[in-house]
């Protein structure tokens, strides 16, 4: 009998089935959709969260300019394609055969298209701009406070390196962290600057993925940070091909 | 990046026997846990066997214990699982992965494409 058997859930991911079969009677767990193995010691793939996502029941949803290129997510969820790593396959098609190729945090960076379409290359989001407006305060928050304690959050709860954290900028009631991540700078092991945005994005709503973990309590010196508006900007390393239709529509 | 291959499948009577290898690269292979893992048709995956990284310690569940071995060269960057006394039950597609043991928790991080193995008369 084991500690594994006591409390054999999943304490970076709730969306999972658990049971202590694994090696000498330890916990394995599997993510909801794709039944694929999770490591519970770290953050799981976006990819592997929108598809468990999709398969449970439908009740539960100085300041930067963002380039030309940036990218909000407006289509929404959708049941993803996800590699045997987890991570979101280039292309992905829906059951009427309209396909789309994506970045690596999933975004739609094509148009449309049908079964013919190619994406070669899974093009990675290098660049993540999340922007929040808080909620009214009897003042502004201190800069550096306020950037202490996101880059701690960042950190601590989400386990993604400092050096990933670029910058927090703050005009209230504006808040703008920015997270930076090349190909060439990413380990083994280190939490995707992609995979920590969806897990604050998901926090930030209400809707947090940690297993019985609170809610996201964030604070300032004691004073709660409310946010009332979020928006993510994603930039890959190479910019999204549009058609001008969409771009002037 | 980590490639794993395995060979050594195939049809083999009840009560016979088969060696699986997997020849791992891309990864210090010397200090990673490993596993086999099979996948039955239309059933979802299992380990079937556990091995550290200097091969010290293994585990095995009850359906394959005192049947299964499993083993490992380092020097040639090579696991292998070898079978004995097959039964129907173990066809599946054997892949072998690469593992992480914890005190608590258990999970394989990259696989194999896995070899085909098949126990009928």
């Known amino acids: 009998h084991t500690a594994a058997q006591d409390n054999c859930t999943c304490p970076t991911n709730k969306m999972t089935v658990c049971s202590p079969d694994g090696p000498g009677g330890r916990c394995q767990c599997r993510a909801l959709g794709s039944g694929m193995a999770v490591d519970c010691s770290t953050l799981t793939s976006k990819c592997l969260l929108l598809k468990a996502r999709m398969s449970a029941p439908k009740n539960a949803r100085t300041l930067v300019r963002p380039s030309e290129h940036a990218l909000v997510d407006n289509d929404g969820l959708y049941d993803p394609d996800c590699d045997p790593e987890g991570r979101f396959k280039a292309r992905q098609c829906n059951q009427t055969s309209v396909c789309w190729c994506v970045n690596s945090v999933g975004v739609r960076r094509t148009d449309k298209g049908d079964l013919s379409l190619r994406c070669d290359e899974l093009v990675r989001t290098h660049h993540i701009l999340i922007d929040l407006r808080h909620r009214p305060t009897a003042g502004a928050f201190n800069h550096s406070d306020l950037d202490a304690e996101l880059r701690r959050l960042f950190r601590e709860r989400y386990r993604l390196h400092p050096k990933f954290v670029a910058a927090v900028h703050y005009e209230q009631p504006t808040i703008q962290i920015e997270l930076r991540q090349n190909t060439s700078q990413k380990a083994a092991g280190d939490v995707d600057i992609g995979d920590a945005a969806y897990y604050f994005e998901r926090d930030i709503k209400g809707e947090s993925l940690f297993q019985g973990r609170g809610g996201l309590d964030l604070r300032v010196r004691g004073e709660p940070l409310q946010v009332e508006r979020t928006l993510i900007y994603y930039l890959d390393e190479i910019p999204p091909k549009f058609s001008m239709k969409r771009l002037t529509a | 990046q980590v490639q794993l291959q395995e060979s050594g499948g195939g049809l083999v009577q009840p009560g016979g026997s088969l060696r699986l290898s997997c020849a791992a690269s891309?990864?210090?292979?010397?200090?990673?846990?490993m596993s086999w893992v099979r996948q039955a048709p239309g059933k979802g995956p299992e380990w079937v066997s556990y091995i550290n990284a200097d091969g010290s310690k293994t585990y095995y569940p009850d359906t394959v214990k005192g049947r299964f071995t499993i083993s490992r060269d380092n020097s040639k960057n090579t696991l292998y699982l070898q079978m004995n006394n097959l039964r129907a039950e173990d066809t599946a597609l054997y892949r072998c992965?690469?593992?992480?043991?914890?005190?608590?928790?258990?999970?394989?991080?990259?696989w194999g494409q896995g070899t085909m193995v098949t126990v009928s008369s």
């Open positions: 992965a690469r593992a992480k043991l914890t005190d608590t928790h258990y999970v394989e991080d990259y």
């Open positions: 891309g990864f210090p292979f010397s200090s990673a846990d």
